[in-house]
């Protein structure tokens, strides 16, 4: 495979990662697939410093991240350990609220207007952030 040494056009480099910030909304699954088609993943926040960077770029707008509990426990899309990792939930969140009337609870995490996290209905059309790491060998399959 080949290594990515610089960020694609329209992506922002920060601390050896590349970030792309959407300007309109999609449901969480569609945003997740979008990032995968870009050979990236929904943003995984691993530090307060990264949180502040993302927050600065998205502004006070609900924005999906790569964190969900659709299969039970909370999981980051890239396999980063949730339990031991960075968290920035709003007070009393996540609450898996069922009172929205849309069916089911709340299984997908997003940045809220103040940057702190909330769980919400995955079908809501929020903006999203893709992330890919520099110097990481691409997933190109070997030639047969």
């Amino acid at each position: 495979g080949s290594e990515r040494t610089c960020c694609p056009v329209n992506w922002v480099e920060h601390e050896r990662s590349c970030y792309w910030f959407s300007r309109s909304g999609k449901a969480w699954a569609d945003a997740d697939n979008y990032c995968r088609l870009e050979d990236a993943h929904l943003v995984v926040v691993t530090s307060w410093e990264e949180q502040k960077f993302v927050q600065h770029h998205i502004g006070p707008v609900n924005t999906w991240m790569g964190l969900h509990d659709q299969n039970g426990p909370w999981k980051w899309v890239d396999g980063t350990d949730y339990e031991t990792g960075f968290k920035n939930w709003r007070p009393e969140q996540p609450d898996d609220w069922y009172g929205h009337g849309l069916g089911g609870g709340e299984d997908c995490a997003h940045f809220t207007d103040d940057g702190r996290w909330n769980d919400d209905v995955c079908q809501r059309p929020y903006r999203w952030v893709c992330e890919t790491e520099l110097d990481k060998a691409s997933q190109e399959p070997p030639l047969l």
């Epitope: 309109s24 697939n33 979008y34 050979d39 691409s138 997933q139």
Partner: antibody, heavy 120, light 108 residues
Framework: EVQLLESGGGLVQPGGSLRLSCAAS????????MSWVRQAPGKGLEWVSV????????YFADSVKGRFTISRDNSKNTLYLQMDSLRAEDTAVYYC?????????????WGQGTMVTVSS | DIQMTQSPSSLSASVGDRVTITCRSS??????LNWYQQKPGKAPKLLIF???SLHSGVPSRFSGSGSGTDFTLTISSLQPEDFATYYC??????????FGQGTKVEIN
């Protein structure tokens, strides 16, 4: 000049297999997700499959899932569609298309198409 | 999957006419709507992306509008080379993209 050129179409019996190729030129092939879109005779357009730039992520329409495989060779600037267990309803012109405007999920460049006929 | 419905299915018009084609989605797709032109025996060509952005090289007589579920493609003054079939495509559901059934623009 940006160009996509499909090949590999033809007549095949039901249950048979066919492999389509799409040769790309004029752009940085590995930087773009690529799709296959088909059009049955006298009908509209149907998205079939897509593959990310590295080849690491692939998706398929339900109508072809488990029967078709998409792949790419970035060293040869070529996209492939392996079609197995073909059915009469797979008869169509198959186009490869570049997902050139990702933020709109729009296909900005299309090949000229290759005809696949599934018949006994 | 999101269903895309175009109207009319076909229309007859004359050179110089203003032509309007509509596309409706079965659920809100924000502005994730693209328009293509296809001539017989040829591949589709992108005209409009993101509901209203004109693709490079496309004449300014083509324009797009709308958001949510209702979209419009307008040709302000129909030219001989514009007689073709036009398709809308939703880009909201990544990657289960769907197209409208097409609108054929014929010579009156």
């Amino acid at each position: 000049e940006v160009q996509l050129l499909e090949s590999g179409g033809g007549l095949v019996q039901p249950g048979g297999s066919l492999r389509l190729s799409c040769a790309a030129s004029g752009f940085t092939f590995r930087s773009y997700a690529m799709s296959w879109v088909r059009q049955a005779p006298g009908k509209g357009l149907e998205w079939v499959s897509v593959i990310s730039g590295s080849g690491g992520n692939t998706y398929f329409a339900d109508s072809v899932k488990g029967r078709f495989t998409i792949s790419r060779d970035n060293s040869k600037n070529t996209l492939y569609l392996q079609m197995d267990s073909l059915r009469a309803e797979d008869t169509a012109v198959y186009y490869c298309a570049k997902r050139g405007i990702p933020e709109a999920d729009a296909f900005d460049i299309w090949g000229q198409g290759t005809m696949v006929t599934v018949s006994s | 999957d999101i269903q895309m419905t175009q109207s009319p299915s076909s229309l007859s018009a004359s050179v110089g006419d203003r032509v309007t084609i509509t596309c409706r989605s079965s659920q809100s797709i924000n502005s994730y709507l693209n328009w293509y032109q296809q001539k017989p025996g040829k591949a589709p060509k992108l005209l409009i992306f993101a509901a209203s952005s004109l693709h490079s090289g496309v004449p300014s007589r083509f324009s797009g509008s709308g958001s949510g579920t209702d979209f419009t493609l307008t040709i302000s003054s129909l030219q001989p080379e514009d007689f073709a079939t036009y398709y809308c495509q939703q880009g909201y559901n990544t990657p289960t993209w769907t197209f409208g059934q097409g609108t054929k623009v014929e010579i009156n």
